[in-house]
Interface confidence: low
């Protein structure tokens, strides 16, 4: 740990702080009686240049003056912005083994004079806040630069604060620590920022403002809302504000919305009535404040108030549908179904549904409440029945929806014509039809009903349906439509007291089935063969099956097989063929066909008919 400046001194001309592009002369001098022992003439002074503690240059060739063995002067040029360290070392040339000894060092700072500060902006946050100003300092000076913020105002008011910028911190904002009060509302204030460093100084233009120009109110706080008589649409928003606030801006929106409702309120005094809220809806409310109607700045938005409006009784009409099934000669099962109200109609949490089944002559009335969206009852087959359903939340019930229970497919004259089902894409099917040809009574509406054709679907799954006005002849069905599944689609035409229907099968996308039907038995009756099979499992059908094909050929024959194509019916699982020769052994198999193609063959069965040939 040697004292690096015990051996000598280093000086800089013109100064250790220079403008960018200037040169400097660095002189290194040994103190008396210092240097290489016995041989003063062998003293060699060298100058090393370091940037960020890394040696970048030996300035041996930049000597401009030399007193042998006593002092040397070096000229340095092209110094980059920032700080550069120069270290003078003594090299005793007679002793090659000893490294040069440090004599002394100097730091040279290269920078620029400060530019005049610009874009001064001052704010006072809240009536009790303090004035703080910020500015744009201009180009970086690379030197320690002092900034002074001066404020002057009425009644000889003066105030100033200082800060500095260097390579570790930036000074472009100062808080004066003084509070401007509302009684100075009309007064004018002037601020100026002065910048000084070792290479020069500059001053901003004066910036003039009034109390209203710079005071930004604090955002409102403690926001709350009271709902008048627990109303779901009317509420009084309340908040705390600073005393001088004369104007508020309110914004509010349902939580899932993307656009705000905006309201301006003058002299609200922390209270505002809202009248257009949606019941049972999560809302977000925010408020901003201003101290003057025309001038001044808005506060930041307050933190949000998030709350849910109270419930109101449901509005809207339930969409009801039903199924009828005869149980025996004098009883029938009625299954009622309905769709949930959408949130804007439910206006609360639906607690239950009130269901009524009534015989029109008022002889019998069945009533019940249920939390489900379906209800099943057994009623007599005699009499004309009507059903009604209403939805109830904590505030009340919707108006009941009525529907007449008619024989849905009972009137052939009301059956829609030319029903077709075309796949539109993976998720929907376009159903079209023509109106009934000879309807006795006017069609009041069409109902398109669909359900997957899978085992137990009638009992397990409720139907899906769409109500269609009487002048429309098409429907795009998409709810619960999945690709590669066959749906039974019914189009019902309903009049006041009758119903007619037509049925079709359809799918939204199809592939050839995975396998063919499995032949379970071949029996011979009266010189005809009856082929029996089990249907393809539901997941392997991959759409609506259009036909089954029965193939046969003589065993060991290389000829093309013969085939019989059967229209697919779900209820059919056997079919006769009668063109086989007796006492010839045949191989038989089956395939299934969808609109996409034919399945691989099912199992093969051999059979040798015994009867005489046809």
């Amino acid at each position: 740990n040697i004292d690096v400046c015990k051996l000598g001194t280093v000086t800089v001309q013109p100064a250790p702080v220079i403008p960018l592009g200037s040169a400097a002369n660095i002189s290194c001098s040994l103190n008396p009686k210092q240097g290489c022992s016995h041989y003063p003439s062998s003293n060699e002074l060298i100058l090393l240049k370091f940037v960020n503690d890394v040696l970048v240059e030996n300035l041996h060739g930049k000597k401009v003056h030399d007193h042998t063995g006593h002092s040397s002067t070096f000229q340095v040029t092209n110094l980059s912005l920032g700080m550069t360290l120069f270290v003078c070392k003594l090299n005793c040339s007679n002793s090659q083994k000893k490294p040069p000894v440090p004599v002394c060092g100097v730091e040279i700072s290269v920078g620029v004079a400060p530019e005049p500060p610009q874009n001064i902006s001052c704010v006072q946050e809240g009536e009790n806040g303090t004035v703080a100003c910020s500015w744009n300092s201009g180009k970086v000076t690379y030197l320690k630069t002092n900034y002074t913020l001066q404020l002057s105002g009425p009644n000889n008011l003066t105030c100033q604060k200082q800060c500095f910028s260097d390579n570790r911190q930036n000074c472009n904002r100062l808080d004066l620590g003084i509070n401007l009060s509302p009684d100075l509302a009309e007064s004018r204030f002037i601020v100026r920022v002065t910048a000084i460093n070792d290479l020069g100084n500059s001053s901003s233009l004066p910036h003039t403002f009034t109390f209203l120009d710079i005071v930004i109110p604090l955002p409102p706080w403690d926001i709350r809302i009271n709902f008048l008589n627990a109303s779901g649409s009317r509420g009084t928003l309340q908040w705390e504000d600073e005393g001088q606030v004369v104007l508020n801006q309110l914004r509010y929106q349902p939580l899932n919305s993307t656009s705000w409702n905006m309201v301006n309120a003058t002299n609200a005094k922390g209270k505002y009535d809202l009248r257009d809220l949606r019941p049972f809806t999560e809302y977000e409310f925010q408020i901003s404040s201003k101290l003057h109607l025309s001038g001044g700045s808005w506060s930041n938005w307050s933190e949000s108030l998030r709350t849910r409006t109270p419930e109101e009784e449901p509005v809207g009409i339930l969409d009801i549908w039903y199924m009828k099934q005869d149980i025996d000669y004098d009883r029938q099962q009625i299954s009622l179904f309905w769709k949930s109200l959408n949130p804007s109609e439910a206006r609360g949490k639906i607690l239950h549904y009130q269901v009524t089944l009534q015989e029109v002559t008022k002889k019998t009335t069945l009533q019940n409440t249920t939390r489900h969206t379906s209800w099943t009852r057994v009623i007599p087959r005699t009499g004309a029945w009507t059903a009604s359903v209403s939805a109830a939340n904590s505030k009340g019930a919707s108006a009941p929806t009525h529907i007449n229970i008619v024989d849905l497919c009972g009137t052939g004259l009301l059956a829609p014509h030319q029903v077709s089902a075309k796949s539109e894409n993976m998720d929907n099917i376009l159903v079209t039809w023509q109106p009934p040809k000879k309807a006795d009574s006017a069609v009041r509406e069409y109902i398109v009903e669909w359900r997957a054709l899978q085992p137990g679907s009638i009992t397990k799954f409720p139907p899906h349906w769409l109500r269609i006005p009487p002048d429309n002849m098409s429907a795009l069905i998409s709810e619960n439509i999945k690709p590669y599944i066959c749906y039974e689609i019914r189009v019902h035409a309903l009049s006041e007291s009758q119903g007619g229907c037509s049925s079709i099968r359809g799918d939204s996308k199809h592939k050839a089935p995975v396998s063919g039907p499995h032949i379970t038995a071949i029996t011979e009756k009266k010189e005809r063969l009856f082929i029996s099979w089990t249907h393809i499992p539901f997941p392997e059908q991959r759409g609506c099956i259009l036909h089954y094909r029965i193939y046969w050929k003589e065993r060991d024959s290389t000829a093309q097989p013969e085939l019989c194509e059967i229209q697919y019916r779900r209820s059919q699982n056997s079919h006769p063929i009668s063109s086989l020769q007796p006492r010839v052994t045949y191989v038989l198999w089956m395939t299934a066909v969808t609109a996409a193609g034919e399945s691989p063959q099912g199992n093969e069965r051999e059979f040798c008919p015994q009867g005489k040939a046809n």
């Epitope: 926001i223 709350r224 809302i225 809302y283 307050s302 933190e303 949000s304 108030l305 998030r306 849910r308």
Partner: nanobody, 128 residues
Framework: QVQLQESGGGLVQAGGSLRLSCASS????????VGWFRQAPGKERYFVAA????????DYADSVKGRFTISRGNAKNTVYLQMNSLNPEDTAVYYC?????????????????????WGQGTQVTVSS
């Protein structure tokens, strides 16, 4: 700005009780939903309980229902979590949190993202 300070944690035998406190000097604390969350080592932060601004609504994680009770003090600037029938699975650092919104009387959230201000946490250790 809302500063929160939890206290009341410590070591307790299984079956014992502790009462955690969450204090705040912020003037808006009483206007916010306040929740307790806990975090066991190596696990995610887990919702425990929450109370609405006017104490009308409370919510609890299924695992603590019937054992823990959340409440607000009379001055509204403290929220308590009374923990009874503690078991070793309750061992964790317990954090108090205040919502980043003024919450309406109906509003309670179990999502940590709905809470902006958090305390430093207090350690609760339940030994068997």
């Amino acid at each position: 700005q809302v500063q929160l300070q939890e206290s009341g944690g410590g070591l307790v035998q299984a079956g014992g009780s502790l009462r955690l406190s969450c204090a705040s000097s912020g003037r808006t604390f009483s206007s916010r939903t306040v929740g307790w969350f806990r975090q066991a080592p190596g696990k995610e932060r887990y919702f425990v309980a929450a109370i609405s601004r006017d104490t009308a609504y409370t919510d609890y994680a299924d695992s603590v229902k019937g054992r823990f009770t959340i409440s607000r003090g009379n001055a509204k600037n403290t929220v308590y979590l009374q923990m009874n029938s503690l078991n070793p699975e309750d061992t964790a650092v317990y954090y108090c949190a205040a919502s980043h919104i003024y919450s309406g009387s109906h509003y309670i959230s179990a999502r940590s993202s709905d809470y902006m201000y958090w305390g430093q946490g207090t350690q609760v250790t339940v030994s068997s």
